[in-house]
């Protein structure tokens, strides 16, 4: 079991020309809210199909009224996260739909009117228990920036929230037959189940059915904080009579922690809890770790919790860059051969092949002439994925089965008459024309534009075209 969490960072006009008009006006003030729908797997289902993993609706955002003449800014957002609880294992791959809705607050008949402003959808891989993944999606002229993560509800852990964990009994190893929950965590896989209702935050068990409390908590289920109400101050030497601490000067006075770090006292000195992106004794050093959620587009962050730790982003298909921030135009590498059409589906590349070619990259040339015969002495010619017959003289058609009519194309010019002949065609020219196709006029004085006709033929006689 666990929770999918979605944090909307901004919703406003995207970059580039054609900024959208503000969805709210002085006459119709409005506010935004968001809906998220989750489905398992990398399905390309319709928006209307059931949200099998769950759905959630945000609270309504602050009321917004457009300032006349001002371009549409980033619109005010609702507070808090959208949380989608899941009861079973986290599937690892999922599809999401995030809808931005506008609630108009003008004098609407029958209460407020709702309209869908934008809908974005995507398919991602995401391991539960990882850091926030950041994303930017565009819908028309609008741009939505958001982060998301899946976290397990204790005591479940692991990338699918299917394993149970408990603190290690010894710092270096787990008990017999128990694996570490994760190499970078000091916890062991726990097949045992604590007493029903035992607080997952403040209780633990060494044996099945028990509930032992962490320091500061008490009660049968470790849900009752140890009372310190009679103590005025949590600092200074202990008073023997009350068991309470008496004030004294503390190492956190004046807050030695830089960059917004918070100070807490330790028996010997102080400790700074640093905000994201800072580390060091006094939070004086800046650095990025997986806790800062540096990986975009569903990239998986790998790295230790220590601020000195490196991190790398394991990118899903279609993204690259040290933070998976760049979308790869994988079709620009022209992976499809033989004129195939490249389709980048995000999770995979597809090649749509031209006729006569096949294979994942259209690399296989199908033998168009295999098993095909051209009749009447024709020869088969491959080309462009379709077979073609080059026919012997006097034959035509796809397979050279048709006897060709050489006169069908009216080859004799200037009214000459065409006669089919075993070796081709013969043109009988009209008076005044000569040539194999009657293409040359005979000059009025009887001289031809061509050399003299061969012996035995006079101008006007049928000319055989061989």
């Amino acid at each position: 079991a666990g929770v999918f969490e979605l944090q909307i960072h901004s919703f406003g006009p995207g970059p580039g020309p054609g900024a959208p008009r503000s969805p709210c006006s002085a006459r119709l003030p409005c506010r935004l809210f968001f809906r998220v729908c989750l489905k398992p797997g990398l399905s390309e289902e319709a928006a209307e199909s059931p949200c099998a993993l769950g759905a959630a609706l945000s609270a309504r955002g602050p009321v917004y009224t457009e300032q006349p003449g001002a371009p549409a800014p980033d619109l005010p957002l609702p507070d808090g996260l959208l949380q989608v609880p899941f009861r079973d294992a986290w599937p690892g791959t999922f599809s999401f739909i995030i809808e931005t809705w506008r609630e108009e607050l003008g004098d609407q008949i029958g209460g407020p009117a709702w309209s869908l402003l934008a809908r974005v959808a995507g398919r991602r891989r995401l391991a539960a228990g990882g850091p926030w993944a950041r994303d930017i999606q565009r819908a028309g002229a609008w741009e939505l920036r958001f982060s998301y993560r899946a976290r397990c509800e204790p005591p479940a852990v692991g990338t699918a929230c299917t394993r149970l964990c408990r603190p290690r009994s010894a710092p270096s190893r787990c008990g017999p037959g128990l694996r570490p929950c994760a190499p970078l965590e000091d916890e062991c896989e726990a097949p045992l189940v604590c007493r029903a209702g035992c607080s997952p935050e403040h209780g633990f068990c060494e044996q099945p059915g028990e509930c032992r409390c962490l320091e500061g908590w008490t009660g049968p289920l470790c849900t009752v904080p140890v009372s310190t109400s009679s103590c005025l101050s949590p600092r200074g030497p202990s008073s023997a009579t009350t068991g309470c601490l008496v004030p004294g000067p503390g190492p956190c006075d004046g807050n030695p922690c830089a960059n917004g770090g918070s100070c807490s006292e330790t028996p010997r000195s102080f400790e700074c809890t640093c905000p994201r992106g800072f580390y060091g004794l006094r939070c004086e050093v800046s650095g990025v770790t997986c806790a800062d959620g540096p990986c975009f587009n569903g990239g998986l962050c790998v790295g230790g919790a220590d601020p000195d730790s490196a991190y790398i982003c394991h990118c899903p298909p279609g993204f690259q860059g040290s933070n998976c921030e760049k979308r790869v135009d994988r079709c620009s590498l022209q992976p499809c051969r033989n004129g195939g059409l490249c389709l980048d589906l995000g999770h995979a590349l597809r090649c749509r092949c031209r006729a006569g070619f096949a294979g994942p990259r259209c690399e296989h040339d199908l033998d168009d002439c295999a098993g095909r015969a051209c009749a009447n002495g024709g020869t088969c010619v491959e080309g462009g994925g379709a077979h073609r017959c080059s026919c012997a003289l006097g034959f035509g058609g796809r397979d050279c089965r048709e006897r060709a009519d050489p006169c069908a194309a009216r080859p004799c010019a200037h009214g000459g008459r065409c006669y089919a002949h075993f070796s081709g065609l013969v043109c009988a020219c009209a008076p005044g024309y000569m040539g194999a196709r009657c293409e040359f006029p005979v000059h009025p004085d009887g001289a031809s534009a061509l050399p003299a006709a061969p012996p035995g033929l006079r101008p006007g006689d049928p000319q055989r075209y061989l």
Partner: nanobody, 115 residues
Framework: EVQLVESGGGEVQPGGSLRLSCGPS????????VGWVRQAPGKQRNLVAG???????NYAQSVKGRFTISRDNAKNTLYLQMSSLRAEDTAVYYC?????????WGQGTLVTVKP
């Protein structure tokens, strides 16, 4: 279960160099993110250097300029060249690989830096 095997650890003086190797292993392929994780006594495991599945490299602040990670996809092997070693580099170094579904670890090789 396929496992990663590290080699090249040992004892070295401050300022010295070592080259760690991991593999060959069918796990170390270009579609996986790989790296070197170290754990000093009493400390958390941390990623010292890594190469992502899209070829980006990153290093822990404390080793930048001194350590170099590389992979040979043809040999299915991962390397870590360590130079200008310091006492604080003393740790068990683990080879690590992962994709979206799985992560893989070696048994670790001990690097000790002492005068």
């Amino acid at each position: 279960e396929v496992q990663l095997v590290e080699s090249g650890g040992g004892e070295v003086q401050p300022g010295g160099s070592l080259r760690l190797s991991c593999g060959p292993s069918e796990i170390i392929t270009s579609d996986k993110s790989v790296g070197w994780v170290r754990q000093a006594p009493g400390k958390q495991r941390n990623l010292v250097a890594g190469i992502s599945n899209v070829g980006s490299t990153n290093y822990a602040q404390s080793v930048k300029g001194r350590f170099t990670i590389s992979r040979d996809n043809a040999k299915n092997t991962l390397y870590l060249q360590m130079s200008s070693l310091r006492a604080e580099d003393t740790a068990v170094y683990y080879c690590y690989a992962r994709d979206f579904e799985n992560e893989y670890w070696g048994q670790g090789t001990l690097v000790t830096v002492k005068p």
